[in-house]
């Protein structure tokens, strides 16, 4: 019973990283800079995201602009598109593999079958997870870098957008809830089908597999 | 108008030291990171130092690291490198750069100052 | 540390001329290139920042463009003012390090 609410604490948590990934990657709020002029009435906020980028008054009237062309984008904005959109996919691709190992589904009868698929899921999960960081960290760390740059102009300083934030929290998200569906599913290791549904039947498993054994060092 | 010149340059011995005044005008001077750029007899342009508009923090190349100190009066409009163990490679004329809000790089420069090492 | 490979070394073309000066960057720099003008018995002037944008007040035939860690200045229809050495700088990381210049002349 306690394995069942893990995995649905887990495929919960993953769908809110899910969730938070498309908002953080649709939302034009990844780099943010004020222009403050010497009068008030040219205050004004520019957001840049990776599809559009938007400019705010001081008056509240927002417009935005979609990114002309593919080609004349940056690499690393046309990368951090590509790498959204597979983590998006790559996570949606971890709840159908979930839902037909789940529990309460009958796509696969055998237990030691759903064991796996579930354990897939988690692994598929935790690699969205990673993917999603990935262009996170990276517009991160530029505009970190960007700050600490004494020949950046001040007007060409960006600051860390709230898609950002979502877009941590989208990958934390992710981690967690693919480790967790990760730990409802017990190691077979070298023992054969019989120990395993054995052991997959018990409430509390005595070996779990957390997020920490997967490389995500590598990626970060 | 944006104004920067320099002075106390001249020729050293290889060893010794000497110390380059920028005296700022026409702009907040507090307001903006300043840098020293050098100019080799060969016309190659080298980066030397750059220090923050509070003066906080100052960023070298590792060829003058140690031997070179950029220093700001704010108070003053003043920008200061003092420069010891001099070489003969440090031959150069030697610009004051101010920052700019809107544009990245060096944007405004001084007339320059001749430094010449030689025994 | 990055080194810039800046070609030709010297330029000679006639005014009207399409000329293009190139800056290769041998690692990854992104887009934090800079372009100098220093025309004879001056103090160089900025000219190109971000790789692609123009200072104000340089006329419109100056334009920068990046490919990769390939970048190139380009000046549509050459002016006799022109006449100046170029340089390109990067300012990607510590230290800031600039081309060995380009000497463009009149024909």
């Known amino acids: 019973m306690a394995s069942a609410g893990m995995q649905i604490l887990g495929v919960v948590l993953t769908l809110l990283g899910w969730v938070n990934g498309l908002v953080s990657c649709a939302l034009p709020m990844w780099k943010v800079t004020a222009f403050i002029g010497n009068s008030i009435v040219v205050a004004q906020v520019v957001w840049e995201g990776l599809w559009m980028s938007c400019v705010v008054q001081s008056t509240g009237q927002m417009q935005c602009k979609v990114y002309d062309s593919l080609l004349a984008l940056p690499q690393d904005l046309q990368a951090a598109r590509a790498l959204c959109v597979i983590a998006l996919l790559v996570a949606l691709f971890g709840l159908l593999v979930y839902l037909a190992g789940a529990k309460c589904t009958t796509c696969v009868e055998e237990k030691d079958s759903k064991a796996r698929l579930v354990l897939t899921s988690g692994i598929v999960f935790v690699i969205s997870g990673v993917l999603t960081l990935i262009p996170v960290c990276w517009t991160a760390h530029a505009i970190i870098r960007d700050f600490y740059n004494p020949l950046v102009a001040e007007a060409q300083k960006r600051e860390l957008g709230a898609s950002l934030y979502l877009g941590w929290a989208a990958s934390g998200l992710l981690l967690l809830g693919g480790g967790l569906l990760c730990c409802t599913c017990p190691s077979g290791g070298s023992q054969g089908p019989s120990h395993y549904m054995a052991r997959y039947s018990t409430s509390a498993p005595a070996i779990s597999r957390g997020p920490s054994e997967y490389p995500t060092k590598n990626y970060v | 108008e944006v104004k920067l010149v320099e002075s106390g340059g001249g020729l050293v011995q290889p060893g010794g030291s000497l110390r380059l005044s920028c005296a700022a005008s026409?702009?907040?001077?507090?307001?903006?990171?300043m840098s020293w750029v050098r100019q080799t007899p060969a016309k190659r342009l080298e980066w030397v130092v750059t220090i923050s508009s509070g003066g906080g923090r100052t960023y070298y190349p590792d060829s003058v690291k140690g031997r070179f100190t950029i220093s700001r009066d704010n108070a003053k409009n003043t920008l200061y490198l003092q420069m010891s163990s001099l070489r003969a490679e440090d031959t150069a004329v030697y610009y004051c750069i101010r920052g700019d809000y809107r544009y990245d790089g060096f944007a405004y420069w001084g007339q320059g100052t001749l430094v010449t090492v030689s025994s | 540390d990055i080194q810039m490979t800046q070609s030709p070394s010297s330029l000679s073309a006639s005014v009207g001329d399409r000329v293009t000066i190139t800056c290769r960057a041998s690692?990854?720099?992104?887009?934090?290139l800079a372009w100098y003008q220093q025309k004879p018995g001056k103090s160089p002037q900025l000219l190109v920042y971000?790789?692609?944008l123009l200072v104000d007040g340089v006329p419109s035939r100056f334009s920068g463009s990046r490919s990769g860690t390939q970048f190139s200045l380009t000046i549509s229809s050459l002016q006799p003012e022109d006449v100046a050495r170029y340089y390109c700088q990067h300012y990607y990381s510590i230290p800031y390090t600039f081309g060995s210049g380009t000497k463009l002349e009149i024909k």
């Open positions: 971000a790789s692609t």
């Open positions: 690692e990854n720099i992104d887009s934090y």
């Open positions: 026409g702009f907040t001077f507090n307001s903006y990171t």
